[in-house]
C-alpha cells in the first residue's frame, strides 16, 4: 500500500436545503483506471461510512440508489455533493480516495471537510 | 504566512451603513470560511456570523439578521461585512477571522473601528 | 443556542503563580470544538488553544487545556508578565457559535 496526497476544503456551510458541496482532489502518481472514493464522517471520535462509489476513469461515479451522495468526476478530482443534511450531520466529512487498478494500491485520505448545517427556519402557520 | 488586513476605521451618523474590508493573503482562500466578530467598548467578543468562502453560503446571528451582509470577492480575496441602520451600540470594533477545519477560527484580523456618532 | 460561562469574571495573581480557569457549557459537546482565545488591550484575540488541548502554534508550554462534555479548564503553569490579559472560550459544534463572557487575569 502507498501513500497518496488527498486534498479537500476546509469548513463548507450547507445549503438551507441540507445540499453540501466540495471537491476532493488526488494526486495520483499513475494512470490509474479504477478508482474507490470513500466518504467517512467524523463526529464525537467516532467514524462512520456516509457512502462509496467505484469508478472507471472517464466514466461517472456511480453510488448506491439509496446513498444521500452524488458525485462527478474529472481527472484527478472528484465532486462530491451530500444532500438531505440536518443539523445533527454536522460533523468533519473525510474524503478517502483508492486507486483499485492497475497495481500498486495507492491510499489516500483527506484532512476532512468540516460541514456545518444549520435546519430551516419552520415556516409560521398561515391562515388562508 | 498567513495574513488578514482589515480597512480602515470609519466614523458614520445613525442610520447610516458601513462596510469593512479583510483581505486575506498566505492561503487558498476558497478552502476556509471568514467569520465576523465584534467588541463594543470595555466588552467581550460577540460573534455575528460566517461566510463560507467555498460556496458563499452565509449563517448570521439572528441579532444581525436582515440588518448584515457578509460576502466575498475571490478575485482579490478579500471578503467583506456590511451593517446597516447604524446604532450608537454599534459602536465597536469589528473583526474578522479565518475559520478552518473543526470551526477554529485560527487567524485574526488587527480590527476595523467604527465609530456610530451624530 | 450553547451559552458559555466562564468563571471567574477577574483572577488576582502574581507572576510566577499558577492560573486556573473555568469555562461550562449549558450543554455537552464533543471538545474537539472548543478554543481558548487570548485578547491583550488594543489587540485581536490570538487563538491558544483549539480542540480543548491543543496548543497553537507557536503557543509556549505553560498554556494547557483540559476537559470534556460541559467544563473545560485553561491553565497557565507560572504566569510570566505578558499573560496578563483577558481570556475567552468558544465554542464551534453548534451554530450559532459562542464565546464566553471573558475571564480577566491581573496583577495581584
Known amino acids: 500500500c502507498k501513500a497518496m496526497h488527498v486534498a479537500q476544503p476546509a469548513v463548507v456551510l450547507a445549503s438551507s436545503r441540507g445540499i453540501a458541496s466540495f471537491v476532493c482532489e488526488y494526486a495520483s502518481p499513475g494512470k490509474a483506471t479504477e478508482v474507490r472514493v470513500t466518504v467517512l464522517r467524523q463526529a464525537d471520535s467516532q467514524v462512520t461510512e456516509v457512502c462509496a462509489a467505484t469508478y472507471m476513469m472517464g466514466n461517472e461515479l456511480t453510488f448506491l440508489d439509496d446513498s444521500i451522495c452524488t458525485g462527478t468526476s474529472s481527472g484527478n478530482q472528484v465532486n462530491l455533493t451530500i444532500q438531505g443534511l440536518r443539523a445533527m450531520d454536522t460533523g468533519l466529512y473525510i474524503c478517502k480516495v483508492e486507486l483499485m487498478y492497475p497495481p500498486p494500491y495507492y491510499l489516500g485520505i483527506g484532512n476532512g471537510t468540516q460541514i456545518y448545517v444549520i435546519d430551516p427556519e419552520p415556516c409560521p402557520d398561515s391562515d388562508f | 504566512q498567513v495574513q488578514l488586513v482589515q480597512s480602515g476605521a470609519e466614523v458614520k451618523k445613525p442610520g447610516a451603513s458601513v462596510k469593512v474590508s479583510c483581505k486575506a493573503s498566505?492561503?487558498?482562500?476558497?478552502?476556509?470560511?471568514i467569520s465576523w466578530v465584534r467588541q463594543a467598548p470595555g466588552q467581550g467578543l460577540e460573534w455575528m456570523g460566517w461566510i463560507s468562502v467555498y460556496n458563499g453560503n452565509t449563517n448570521y446571528v439572528q441579532k444581525f439578521q436582515g440588518r448584515v451582509t457578509m460576502s466575498t470577492d475571490t478575485s482579490t480575496n478579500t471578503a467583506h461585512m456590511e451593517l446597516r441602520s447604524l446604532r450608537s451600540d454599534d459602536t465597536a470594533v469589528y473583526y474578522c477571522?479565518?475559520?478552518?477545519?473543526?470551526?477554529?477560527?485560527?487567524?485574526w484580523g488587527q480590527g476595523t473601528l467604527v465609530t456610530v456618532s451624530s | 443556542e450553547i451559552v458559555m460561562t466562564q468563571s471567574p469574571a477577574t483572577l488576582s495573581l502574581s507572576p510566577g503563580e499558577r492560573a486556573t480557569l473555568s469555562c461550562r457549557a449549558s450543554?455537552?459537546?464533543?471538545?474537539?470544538?472548543l478554543s481558548w482565545f487570548q485578547q491583550k488591550p488594543g489587540q485581536a484575540p490570538r487563538l491558544l488553544i483549539s480542540?480543548?488541548?491543543t496548543r497553537a502554534t507557536g503557543i509556549p508550554a505553560r498554556f494547557s487545556g483540559s476537559g470534556s462534555g460541559t467544563d473545560f479548564t485553561l491553565t497557565i503553569s507560572s504566569l510570566q508578565p505578558e499573560d496578563f490579559a483577558v481570556y475567552y472560550c468558544q465554542q464551534v459544534y453548534n451554530l450559532p457559535w459562542t464565546f464566553g463572557q471573558g475571564t480577566k487575569v491581573e496583577i495581584k
Open positions: 477571522a479565518r475559520v478552518g477545519v473543526r470551526g477554529i477560527f485560527d487567524y
Open positions: 498566505g492561503y487558498t482562500f476558497t478552502n476556509y470560511g
Open positions: 450543554q455537552s459537546f464533543s471538545s474537539s470544538y
Open positions: 480542540g480543548a488541548s
